[in-house]
């Protein structure tokens, strides 16, 4: 009897459809995630399993609080999409699919500095590119640890440049960029560049 | 599974308009960068356009102008608006997608919808 | 704008053949390129990314190489099923693109 009951309650939508969440939605190759499995009825003995496609992954008991299972995403097919079923009794419902998305973490950028010098001036060139990387790549000029560009999105493989010009310093100035894309808390630096001073004739890459 | 679906192709008159439709299952178009392709009869593929996740988009030289590439999100759907349409542009067009969100080669495809553009 | 241009235009093979198409880019592309195969009144099927990388489900008688400016598709014992026309693309850059794809090459039977 407490099965029919269980069942027609879900007809009546009283037991409504799990949830399934992550806390990123975004991942790289090999990189460890949980995803929970939860439901609004909280008293219920509810049994939670998880699917990828047709494929069965884990089945977990629970009540009031969500299922956590835990999965390394190592191949592109493993991205999803999941599906969570909970069951009560013989009687069940599925949540909504979830994918991840796959990005693949930027490789440390390249910066290249091209100046033209004039008596007064210096027009100041920079190229930043990260080789390997998902895009879009956002990349961020800095002198002397300062930002001084804002973030310059890539779609494509070509370099960001940016272009600044100024009075001919008296001290030595340093240059390196930033690469970043959707991978949270994931960024990578160029090796720095130091520009000389305008004292003498060392100024290895101007155009004069 | 990711599936893309294209509509709204048919014959249409020389100086006309036409709106396709591309509809995405599977795949959260925010991510991911969406193409257009198409085909004339008996020729290559022509890259169109595409637009990324930010709702940015990027054209072929030629298609500038008289193409217009945009999205909605709440129906996970791409639009590529045709105007001032030419013989030249009988073509089958392709939306597909990229596996990354900007350019990239082109995984997923579309089973083309026929334009005919004829008096 | 980057140009590819894809060598020959048209081959004609026998079943078991071992088959070369090239594709050539008028400026380094890394190795951004891709090879596509399409069969008549079909949409394309992507073969090989990254200029070497197999895509999932093709055969491993398909193999891409090269990089900079030359690339090769090579079909290393044709089969039936192989006739059709071969392209490639680029993935390097959005800079005043014409078209991303080659010209393309129409494998027939012999």
């Known amino acids: 009897r407490k099965a029919v009951l269980d069942c027609e309650a879900m007809k009546t939508n009283e037991f409504p459809s799990p949830c399934l969440d992550s806390k990123t939605k975004v991942v790289m190759k090999g990189q460890n995630v949980s995803m929970f499995c939860s439901h609004k009825n909280k008293s219920l003995q509810i049994t939670y399993s998880l699917f990828r496609r047709k494929t069965h992954l884990g089945t977990q008991d629970g009540k009031g609080e969500p299922a956590i299972f835990n999965l390394s995403i190592t191949e592109a097919h493993e991205s999803g999409p999941y599906k969570c079923k909970a069951q009560v009794t013989s009687c069940s419902k599925y949540s909504r699919d979830f994918s991840f998305t796959i990005v693949d973490p930027v490789t440390s950028p390249v910066l290249n500095i091209m100046v033209i010098q004039t008596e007064t001036d210096r027009h100041i060139t920079l190229h930043c590119l990260s080789v390997n990387g998902s895009l879009p790549i956002n990349y961020t000029f800095f002198e002397n640890h300062v930002a001084i560009s804002p973030a310059i999105s890539k779609y494509d493989r070509e370099p960001a440049e940016f272009n600044l010009t100024k009075k001919n310093p008296g001290e030595e100035e340093e240059y390196r960029c930033e690469a970043k894309n959707r991978l949270p808390n994931y960024a990578t630096y160029s090796h720095p560049v130091t520009m000389p001073s305008t004292g003498g004739d060392s100024c290895p890459f101007c155009l004069k | 599974e990711v599936q893309l679906v294209e509509s709204g192709g048919g014959l249409v008159q020389p100086g006309g308009s036409l709106r396709l439709s591309c509809a995405a299952s599977?795949?959260?178009?925010?991510?991911?960068?969406m193409n257009w392709v198409r085909q004339a009869p008996g020729k290559g593929l022509e890259w169109i356009g595409m637009?990324?996740?930010?709702?940015?988009?990027f054209y072929a030289n030629w298609a500038k102008g008289r193409f217009t590439i945009s999205r909605d999100n709440s129906k996970n759907t791409v639009y590529l608006q045709m105007n001032s349409l030419r013989a030249e542009d009988t073509a089958v067009y392709y939306c597909?997608?990229?596996?990354?969100?900007?350019?990239?080669?082109?995984?997923?495809w579309g089973q083309g919808t026929l334009v005919t553009v004829s008096s | 704008d980057i140009q590819m241009t894809q060598s020959p235009s048209s081959l004609s093979a026998s079943v078991g053949d071992r088959v070369t198409i090239t594709c050539q880019a008028s400026?380094?592309?890394?190795?951004?390129l891709a090879w596509y195969q399409q069969k008549p009144g079909k949409a394309p099927k992507l073969l090989i990314y990254?200029?070497?990388t197999l895509a999932s489900g093709v055969p491993s008688r398909f193999s891409g190489s090269g990089s900079g400016t030359d690339f090769t598709l090579t079909i290393s014992s044709l089969q039936p099923e192989d006739f059709a026309t071969y392209y490639c693309?680029?993935?390097?850059?959005?800079?005043?693109?014409?078209?991303?794809f080659g010209t393309g090459t129409k494998v027939t039977v012999l």
């Open positions: 693309q680029q993935a390097y850059s959005l800079s005043n693109v014409d078209n991303f």
């Open positions: 400026q380094s592309i890394s190795s951004y």
């Open positions: 597909a997608v990229g596996s990354d969100g900007g350019i990239s080669d082109f995984n997923i």
């Open positions: 637009i990324v996740g930010g709702g940015i988009t």
């Open positions: 990254r200029a070497s």
């Open positions: 599977g795949i959260d178009l925010s991510y991911y960068a």
